[in-house]
């Protein structure tokens, strides 16, 4: 009889080579049984992982497992680093393996981003 | 159940290059890494490397970067090795092996292939 | 990279007796997530590996419970409490907390 606990099916060590300015989705697959769990992602800095509160997110429904998915829309250079998923069932906090991006930017360093990314990111301007 | 079924023997001249394959069953090959380990005559296990068939990404031992490939089919549930610029050096068993969501590390591993390299 | 050092070379027992095997890392193969990523194999003659033990001390399934794992840190034992003729062959350590993953140069089982 298969576990009826939240189970997280994030590769450990894995890894993903992207670029910037490009849409990416990262996945953390997602077993439940009944009650779909609350689930967060957050970013390693160090040792803490730092809660992604406004970013865009998303669940894929498939028919053994669900996939919570976080949005690059677009990708920047500084997204790069490693990510945790996390899911609150029954009082537990489950946390996923880390997943790391490595992400190359194709612009040169000097180069603004572009309105889009303004757009899309607003609270860059307030860095 | 589940099974890694490697190809057959090689017998190839030095400077060409080779593809082994290892066909898995019984489970997605999405969901595991597929490590490949070489085996010299009489001599100990080398870790080769490995790949995220999930989306291609490859881990190599430094030392052996540059003249093994790993890829992979997720259509096929099959992953490769590629060895090219073949020396007597690269005279060995390759094995495959698997390493579920990363945590399993070489739970299931193939049966071997020869690859003997010769004038 | 880590450098996995197996001692001893050889091990000469008796069927019945009991046997150890080290294996010592050159670093702690403690990971960030709190496990220790170290493996034990059993070749035998003319055989692909087979995985034993996992986590230092889980054992495999259909291993027998006369095989134990421990340690932590740096320093890990595989012990073998009355050898059987099935066990012969060369054990393996195998480090998969650090790239590149390392494996031990293998001890070798065998009879007196």
């Known amino acids: 009889k298969e576990s009826c606990d939240v189970q997280l099916y994030i590769k450990r060590q894995s890894e993903h080579s992207i670029l910037a300015g490009d849409p990416f989705e990262l996945e953390c697959p997602v077993k439940y049984c009944a009650n779909r769990p609350h689930v967060t992602w957050c970013k390693l800095n160090g040792t803490t992982c730092v809660k992604l509160e406004d970013r865009q997110t998303s669940w894929k429904e498939e028919k053994n497992i669900s996939f919570f998915i976080l949005h690059f829309e677009p990708v920047l250079p500084n997204d790069n680093g490693s990510y945790r998923c996390s899911a609150n069932f029954q009082s537990n906090l489950i946390e996923s393996h880390s997943t790391t991006l490595y992400v190359t930017d194709v612009k040169s360093a000097s180069e603004r981003p572009s309105k889009d990314e303004m757009a899309s990111r607003p609270w860059l301007l307030y860095r | 159940e589940v099974q890694l079924q490697q190809s057959g023997a090689e017998l190839v001249r030095p400077g060409a290059s080779v593809k082994l394959s290892c066909t898995v069953s019984?489970?997605?090959?999405?969901?595991?890494?597929v490590h490949w380990v070489k085996q010299r005559p009489e001599q100990g296990l080398e870790w080769i490397g490995r790949?995220?068939?999930?989306?291609?990404?490859?881990k190599y031992d430094p030392k052996l970067q540059g003249t093994a490939t790993i890829t992979a089919d997720t259509s096929s549930n099959t992953a490769y090795l590629q060895l090219s610029s073949l020396t007597s050096e690269d005279t060995a068993v390759y094995y495959c092996a698997t390493d579920y969501y990363g945590s399993s590390l070489l739970d299931y591993w193939g049966q071997g292939t020869t690859l003997t390299v010769s004038s | 990279e880590v450098v996995m050092t197996q001692t001893p070379l050889t091990l000469s027992v008796t069927i019945g007796q009991s046997a150890s095997i080290s294996c010592k890392s050159s670093?702690?193969?403690?990971?960030?997530?709190?496990?220790?990523?170290l493996n034990w194999f059993l070749q035998r003659p003319g055989q692909s590996p087979k995985r034993l033990m996992h986590?230092?001390?889980k054992l495999d399934s259909g291993v027998p419970d006369r095989f134990t794992g421990s340690g932590s840190g740096t320093d890990f034992t595989l012990k073998i409490s009355g050898v059987e003729a099935e066990d012969l062959g060369v054990y393996y350590c195998w480090q998969g907390t650090y790239f590149p993953y390392t494996f031990g140069g293998g001890t070798k089982l065998e009879t007196k």
């Open positions: 986590l230092v001390s």
């Open positions: 790949i995220d068939p999930a989306n291609g990404h490859t």
């Open positions: 019984g489970f997605n090959i999405k969901d595991t890494y």
């Open positions: 670093q702690s193969l403690l990971d960030s997530d709190g496990k220790t990523y």
